[in-house]
Every structure is written in C-alpha cells, then in structure tokens.
Amino acid sequence: AQEVQQSPHCTTVPVGASVNITCSTSGGLRGIYLRQLGPQPQDIIYYEDGVVPTTDRRFRGRIDFSGSQDNLTITMHRLQLSDTGTYTCQAITEVNVYGSGTLVLVTEEQSQGWHRCSDAPPRASALPAPPTGSALPDPQTASALPDPPAASALP
C-alpha cells in the first residue's frame, strides 16, 4: 500500500528562521498537498510535477520547493509565531494517504529553551466530522490527522 514518509516529526525554530519538511512516497501520485492542521485545517500548498505550485497567500513568497512530488522538500521561510502548528503531507493517489505530521514550534528567541520537541511523532486521530445542525466542530479534535477519504477525482 502507498505510504507517505514525512520528516521531521517535530522541530523548534526561532521567529524569522526557516524549516524544511520532507514528504516521500513510492510514486504514482497526482500531486501532494501540505495541510496545516488546527481548529480550521487548510491546505497551504499544492505541488505537482510540471505545474506551477499553488501557495496560500499567507505563505506566498515564503515557500520554496526542491525535489519532485515523489520526494518533495518544502522550505518555509521567515517563520512567524502564528505559523506554529502541525503540518501534514497529503498524497493524492487512487486512495489518498497522509504523512504522520510535522509539529513546527516557532518561538521567540529568548524563550526557545522552554519549548522543545519530544521524540514522539504528532498524535494521529480523526479530524472533526462535518457539522450537523448548529454545532461547531470541537477544536480539541481538529488538530490531528484525517482518515483517508475515498478516491477523489480531478475536477
């Protein structure tokens, strides 16, 4: 079965620094998304070989790519405190698959000693189910990884 190897599991960086996230697969992809998880999960980039990458405006001018969609390194530059979060690779295949996630901790330089990564990878559980009635999704459950959905067709 197709898998996404993602590294690192966690990294602590000061404001203004850069971070590399690598997503590796065994091939056969249509493309790859990097999704920032949290109370409102959203894709921040889409990369496909031979296609101009799509980047969320919040990260425009701050992201570089190297490699190919099968072994992609995404470099996020000039990190801000608000960029702290878990980022996961999503490979678009016949059945979409997800990386284990990278927790990026952006800290003010003087406080770096207080915020360190543990060796454990980010916890993987389900994203919130679609809302029913008037209930909003519980942000507590919205910060982990989604179950792979059924294969999604190109528009």
Partner: nanobody, 122 residues
Framework: QVQLQESGGGLVQPGGSLRLSCTAS????????MGWFRQAPGKEREFVST????????YYADSVKGRFTISRDNAKNTVYLEMNSLKPEDTAVYYC???????????????WGKGTQVTVSS
C-alpha cells in the same frame, strides 16, 4: 449540513460582466472549500473555479483564467464569482458547491446549490 443558494445570474451582452453570489446557510462555513461549476445545454457539468477555506488559494479552469475571479467572505457565509469579458460560450447554469475540508484541485463537492442561469447573447 450546508444549504447553498446562488444568485446574480441573468442576460448579458458579449464582453459584459456579471457577479454571481452563493450564500451558505449552516455553521462552519470557513471549514469548507467552495467551488463553482457550470453546465451548458446538452453538455456535461464543467469545473470553473475553487477557493480554499481561508480564501488564500484559488484555482481556475483554463477556459476562464484571467476573466473570472473567485472570492469569499467568511463573515457573510458567501462565495462570489466575478465574471468579466463574457463570451457566448459562457452561457450555462452556474452551480455553487461546497466540500468540508476539501482540496482545491481535487474537489468533489459534498453539497450543491440549485444553480443560476447565465446567458451571454447580443
């Protein structure tokens, strides 16, 4: 559950402009990737554009790139399609769609509106 209601369609001359709106009822609008599709008489439904949940990323069909602009106002639960330099071949029923936590370029649409007619003719 999200219900979608399109508006803003009508008759316009070639080269003219229209702005379509799609208002969503229900909660958590900002968790949905939104899209526009269209269907001309006797043809299959065709992808037009999508916009990410935050509004920070957009994607367009080649046939409308540079002429159409998608945008959204999460405070108003509304997504817009600004259509300029309209051509007779843009004549179609335009549908709004929503997908919870969807992907921009691999959009399926969990929820659909009923559509609004756009006719481009002199």
């Amino acid at each position: 559950q999200v219900q979608l209601q399109e508006s803003g369609g009508g008759l316009v001359q070639p080269g003219g402009s229209l702005r379509l709106s799609c208002t969503a009822s229900g909660r958590a609008f900002s968790m949905y990737v939104m899209g526009w599709f269209r269907q001309a008489p006797g043809k299959e439904r065709e992808f037009v554009s999508t916009i990410s949940a935050s509004g920070g990323m957009t994607y367009y069909a080649d046939s409308v790139k540079g002429r159409f602009t998608i945008s959204r106002d999460n405070a108003k639960n509304t997504v817009y399609l600004e259509m300029n330099s309209l051509k007779p071949e843009d004549t179609a029923v335009y549908y709004c769609a929503a997908e919870y936590l969807g992907n921009l370029r691999h959009f399926r649409g969990d929820h659909w509106g009923k559509g609004t007619q756009v006719t481009v003719s002199s």
